[in-house]
């Protein structure tokens, strides 16, 4: 069992990774926050059955403050929520208008987290002199995952404990009492 994806014990409740709910409609329609991973391009010819890698799903960007006990992150973090339906979809006849419309059929495809990153955040805490930091595990990208009848919800939950792959590059290093700088939750087998 996992660290509960670096469990957020905050007042801002964040579902465990791999268990994000469908975003509310107002988020879905917020074009400034959404981007289709395939750039909005249709996946080749609509009648072709492509590999799942040809399809993608929407990544909703949102920001939040990380909290831990009475502490709050100095800056908000940007996170993704994986949303929307995945292909392969087939153009099926629309009985009403004789037109074509997208409708998923066959195996179930889900939009789920693909990669994670761990981000260090500096916490601002009331009282207490020592700066505190924590690392939060954030969804870095989403992908379409084919779920057969044998891979139901339990498969989705596996992604919550998938090893994180944090972004490369150095982050700011605020710390306390160090010569180098100015300032400074997996399940526990009980």
């Amino acid at each position: 069992q996992g660290w509960q994806a670096f469990k957020n014990d905050a007042t801002e409740i964040i579902p465990e990774l791999g268990e994000y709910p469908e975003p509310p409609p107002e988020l879905e329609n917020n074009k400034t926050m959404n981007r289709a991973e395939n750039g909005g391009r249709p996946p080749h010819h609509p009648f072709e059955t492509k590999d799942v890698s040809e399809y993608s799903c929407r990544e909703l960007h949102f920001t939040r403050y990380v909290t831990d006990g009475p502490c709050r992150s100095a800056k908000p973090v940007t996170e993704l929520v994986c949303s929307g339906q995945c292909g392969p979809a087939r153009l099926l006849p629309n009985a009403i208008g004789r037109g074509k419309w997208w409708r998923p059929s066959g195996p179930d495809f889900r939009c789920i987290p693909d990669r994670y990153r761990a981000q260090r955040v500096q916490l601002l805490c009331p009282g207490g002199e020592a700066p505190r930091a924590r690392k939060v595990r954030l969804v870095a990208s989403c992908k379409c995952k084919r779920l057969t009848r044998f891979h139901n919800q339990s498969e989705l939950k596996d992604f919550g404990t998938e090893a994180a792959r944090p972004q490369k590059g150095r982050k700011p290093r605020p710390r306390a009492r160090s010569a180098k700088a100015n300032q400074a939750e997996l399940e526990n087998a009980y």
Partner: antibody
Framework: QVQLVQSGAEVKKPGASVKVSCKVS????????QHWVRQAPGKGLEWMGW????????EYASKFQGRVTMTEDTSTDTAYMELSSLRSEDTAVYYC???????????WGQGTTVTVSS | DIQMTQSPSSLSASVGDRVTITCRAS??????LNWYQQKPGKAPKLLIY???TRWTGVPSRFSGSGSGTDFTLTISSLQPEDFATYYC?????????FGGGTKVEIK
């Protein structure tokens, strides 16, 4: 499951150095903070410091400043703690611990006994 | 350094008893306090953090309370596996420091 496996017991002479390793599995070490805590025979726990493997950041207890060095090899998910200028009072069990914060120790290694004796 | 004083240093109790361990800080540490359990020859395990939040998987019979300088760890109904030594740890200011421990023994 997160597991921390430490290197074996060491016997050192006063003035020598010791380097204890801690292999982390179940999570990439750079996604965590690594802590070191020691416990002298029959005594309580003593925090030595923490490090951030991703950026090489460290915070050492002032008592150990200048004698302790905490490093990591992120390619092997292994943390190291080196203590120099050993004296008899450094005889203790040394624990590595890991967590998502700089202030709590979520998971612990099994401990490494270091004996300093002439 | 902030001194953490635990009392009692040891206590004897029976299975089913309610046990209370106290931890006092030498200065105000708000609720920046953790509790750990350690069994002989084993590494400690995190029980409580932020003074009162149970760590994942810790049974509900363990509870923490307090703020400022005085804190308590309570085991509502002592179980055979609870006989161990318990440590508090402050993280209000560096260096993080532990209490001297409270050993809970079988009566």
């Amino acid at each position: 499951q997160v597991q921390l496996v430490q290197s074996g017991a060491e016997v050192k002479k006063p003035g020598a150095s010791v380097k204890v390793s801690c292999k982390v599995s179940g999570f990439p070490i750079k996604d965590t903070f690594q802590h070191w805590v020691r416990q002298a025979p029959g005594k309580g726990l003593e925090w030595m410091g923490w490090s951030d493997p991703e950026i090489g950041d460290t915070e050492y207890a002032s008592k150990f400043q200048g004698r302790v060095t905490m490093t990591e090899d992120t390619s092997t998910d292994t943390a190291y703690m080196e203590l120099s200028s050993l004296r008899s009072e450094d005889t203790a069990v040394y624990y590595c611990a890991t967590g998502d914060t700089t202030y709590k120790f979520d998971f612990w290694g099994q401990g490494t006994t270091v004996t300093v004796s002439s | 350094d902030i001194q953490m004083t635990q009392s009692p240093s040891s206590l004897s109790a029976s299975v089913g008893d309610r046990v209370t361990i106290t931890c006092r800080a030498s200065q105000d540490i708000s609720n920046y306090l953790n509790w750990y359990q350690q069994k002989p020859g084993k590494a400690p395990k995190l029980l409580i953090y932020w003074a009162s939040t149970r760590w994942t998987g810790v049974p509900s019979r363990f509870s923490g309370s307090g703020s400022g300088t005085d804190f308590t760890l309570t085991i509502s109904s002592l179980q055979p596996e609870d006989f161990a030594t318990y440590y508090c740890q402050q993280y209000s200011d560096y260096p993080w420091t532990f209490g001297g421990g409270t050993k809970v023994e079988i009566k």
